[in-house]
Amino acid sequence: EEELQVIQPEKSVSVAAGDSATLNCTVSSLIPVGPIQWFRGAGPGRELIYNLKEGHFPRVTPVSDPTKRNNMDFSIRISNITPADAGTYYCVKFRKGSPDVELKSGAGTELSVRAKPS
């Protein structure tokens, strides 16, 4: 059995304040069954950045077409970046359950925010 891989190819991304940041994440398999979620930070205090089914995330949009079949690209775009958005972002695969159980995290992508050019 090939083990599911959660791939965040960029270790770091630098974006100018006011611009959009793209955080890339792909998975190697459609199974196990379960959702992908994005978080900033790790551990119990981490902040949920994007979850398709629950919550309202007006600045975050999926990069891939939401009607694309058998999607394995879970990259997101965050608009209007501010210095407060700096941090390490993790793409996390969950196994479906009651509740869903965290299965595997990507290695993380550190987002740094540059001052807006004058």
């Epitope: 190697s28 069954v33 398709l52 089914k53 939401p66 694309k68 999607n71 879970f74 479906k96």
Partner: antibody, heavy 120, light 108 residues
């Protein structure tokens, strides 16, 4: 071309057992979830079970009696049915799961079905 | 468990007519609805997913709409090969996946 071919159906007495198989071809079997859906004579569709990797899901009506499994080396899906009841009589379809976007699963390809009759 | 209610149970239609099927969910399922066609003695066939996306090879006379709890499948001009039973399915919250009871389309 995606193909799903079920086998193993037949007549069995109440309390008996049966093992269904579904041979898959035309897609990368090992990376997709696959499911069993049944249809009692003259009735509608009822989901039975789904398997991802080692993750399995069952309808309450079959939990504890049916076991879904897969052999990726043989591209084959199985359904072991024990303690069969008259109400399990149905055509059993094997179905390939498909996902859309970041969302849940539906069934984009179906086999032709195999009839299971539970009768004394 | 999310219950899907399809109406009407049976439709008697003449070829060339416009046909509309209804599927109502007992709670919000967003757009996570699929529609299937089943002809007698055959397996179901996927028509629509994500409420409104046509599957590959499905004629454009089939269209789906709706979100939340109310969904519609429309056949703009019924062809003779379209007779059969139509089922909706939700995949927003599972297990279990649930199907509607079906709408049978028969010749008037």
């Amino acid at each position: 071309e995606v193909q799903l071919v079920e086998s193993g159906g037949g007549v069995v007495q109440p309390g008996g057992s049966l093992r269904l198989s579904c041979a898959a071809s035309g897609f990368s079997f090992s990376i997709y979830a696959v499911s069993w859906v049944r249809q009692a004579p003259g009735k509608g569709l009822e989901w039975v079970s789904t398997i991802g990797a080692d993750d399995t899901y069952y309808a309450d009506s079959v939990k504890g009696r049916f076991t879904i499994s897969r052999d990726n080396s043989k591209n084959t899906l199985y359904l072991q049915m024990n303690s069969l009841r008259a109400e399990d009589t149905a055509v059993y379809y094997c179905a390939k799961d498909s996902t859309v976007g970041w969302s849940g699963d539906f069934f984009d390809y179906w086999g032709q079905g195999t009839l299971v009759t539970v009768s004394s | 468990e999310i219950v899907l209610t399809q109406s009407p149970a049976t439709l008697s239609v003449s070829p060339g007519e416009r046909v509309t099927f209804s599927c109502r969910a007992s709670q919000n399922v967003r757009s996570d609805i699929a529609w299937y066609q089943q002809k007698p003695g055959q397996a179901p066939r996927l028509l629509i997913y994500a409420a409104s996306s046509r599957d590959t090879g499905i004629p454009d006379r089939f269209s789906g709409s709706g979100s939340g709890t109310d969904f519609t499948l429309t056949i703009s001009s019924l062809q003779s090969e379209d007779f059969g039973v139509y089922y909706c399915q939700q995949y927003y919250d599972w297990p279990p996946f649930t199907f509607g009871g079906g709408t049978k389309v028969e010749i008037k």
